[in-house]
Interface confidence: low
């Protein structure tokens, strides 16, 4: 009686079980009663990552530099190429098909978490006592200058965008 299901790494065709091609190889011809499955290795720019009966290998992913991509890991006959983003850019999606520039934190905001190849800059508002007067993808909020430690007094209050202005103490006349 012909089989209705085949073992692992086999497939059913013409009422018989044939061996699948191993990762890195494609199917050339199915097995017959007298011959084994015929497989061929994928070419240099192609891959297949599973036991398969594919007649064509998949093309390696192209890391398009015009989209800000570069090769993180070169593909093999059994694995696809892995792309990542150039310095200063991060992936737009889980599949990293294109990249976008890291955003800068505007004045009044500092960098909470520096961007990586897969995540954007995280900004946070500068709390009281801190400021940022630049638009930057790297700078954290900086603390206001301590006038007292310089034996000076605050002449102009700081904001989330500006440092305090220190000045000399008013000397009392005798």
């Amino acid at each position: 009686e012909p089989p209705t299901a085949c073992r692992e790494k086999q497939y059913l065709i013409n009422s018989q079980c044939c061996s699948l091609c191993q990762p890195g190889q494609k199917l050339v011809s199915d097995c017959t009663e007298f011959t084994e499955t015929e497989c061929l290795p994928c070419s240099e720019s192609e891959f297949l990552d599973t036991w398969n009966r594919e007649t064509r290998c998949h093309q390696h992913k192209y890391c398009d530099p015009n989209l800000g991509l570069r090769v993180q890991q070169k593909g093999t006959s059994e694995t696809d190429t892995i792309c990542t983003c150039e310095e200063g850019l991060h992936c737009m999606s889980e599949s990293c098909e294109s990249c976008v520039p890291h955003r800068s934190c505007l004045p009044g905001f500092g960098v909470k978490q520096i961007a990586t190849g897969v995540s954007d800059t995280i900004c946070e508002p500068c709390p009281v006592g801190f400021f940022s007067n630049v638009s930057s993808a790297f700078e954290k909020c900086r603390p206001w200058t301590s006038c007292e430690t310089k034996d000076l007094v605050v002449q102009q209050a700081g904001t989330n965008k500006t440092d305090v202005v220190c000045g000399p103490q008013d000397r009392q006349r005798a």
Epitope: Q72, I82, C91, S93, E94, S95, C96, T116, G117, V118
Partner: antibody, heavy 126, light 112 residues
């Protein structure tokens, strides 16, 4: 509000069939992949099946393959689980679950199984 | 299939005290895009499971900040900074990298 409501559970003899339904409301059903997850009495969670948002891709756990079929009708905002050749070990609470995602810059990001129904109980007993 | 192993399986905790649950995977859950495809779910007594953490460390909407997820690759941890009475139940980790999805055995957290 976002809601999933299962129905169709009950007591059935081994070898018989049952069809579970899940009614979705409060969200665009056709935009989400959906899962069935089950929990046998006093046991942990076991994944059963998943179906893509358009119904084109379906996967079933080995323990139910060939016996259970997941399907959906987007025009009715409904998810189904057709259960044939039921066994005693299929006794469980069956949950309908949404595969969450968030849309960022035109791309979908996985967001966990973010909405669960209240569950429907299937008891297979002779 | 990917196997997830949780420890401990039972965790008695005094209210206000921290709690920590480990989840170990039989293979890496770190995808090439840098995300760890591991979620944490809580099933309170008599209720359906609810999502706590997705992609290893992202808190789901409405989840209190006393819950945090960490780890990468094969080793993950769920931490509760200060346990509250409403946090009791069974905690499950689940891998979302491959089909079939698989869950850990569950960790029962109860009040000491």
């Amino acid at each position: 509000q976002v809601q999933l409501v299962e129905s169709g559970g009950g007591v059935v003899q081994p070898g018989r069939s049952l069809r579970l339904s899940c009614a979705a409301s409060g969200f665009t059903f056709s935009s989400y992949g959906m899962h069935w997850v089950r929990q046998a009495p006093g046991k942990g969670l076991e994944w059963v099946a998943v179906i893509s948002k358009d119904g084109g891709n379906k996967y079933h756990a080995d323990s139910v393959k060939g016996r259970f079929t997941i399907s959906r009708d987007n025009s009715k905002n409904a998810l189904y689980l057709q259960m044939n050749s039921l066994r005693v070990e299929d006794t469980a609470v069956y949950y309908c679950v949404r595969r969450g995602h968030q849309l960022v810059l035109g791309y979908y990001y996985y967001n966990g199984l973010d909405v669960w129904g209240q569950g429907t109980t299937v008891t297979v007993s002779s | 299939d990917i196997v997830l192993t949780q420890s401990p399986l039972s965790l008695p905790v005094t209210p206000g005290e921290p709690a920590s649950i480990s989840c170990r995977s039989s293979q890496s859950l770190l995808y090439s895009n840098g995300y760890n495809f591991l979620d944490w779910y809580l099933q309170k007594p008599g209720q359906s499971p609810q999502l706590l953490i997705y992609l290893g460390s992202n808190r789901a909407s409405g989840v209190p900040d006393r819950f945090s997820g960490s780890g990468s690759g094969t080793d993950f941890t769920l931490k509760i900074s200060r346990l509250e009475a409403e946090d009791v139940g069974v905690y499950y980790c689940m891998q979302a990298l491959q089909t079939p999805r698989t869950f850990g055995q569950g960790t029962k957290v109860e009040i000491k």
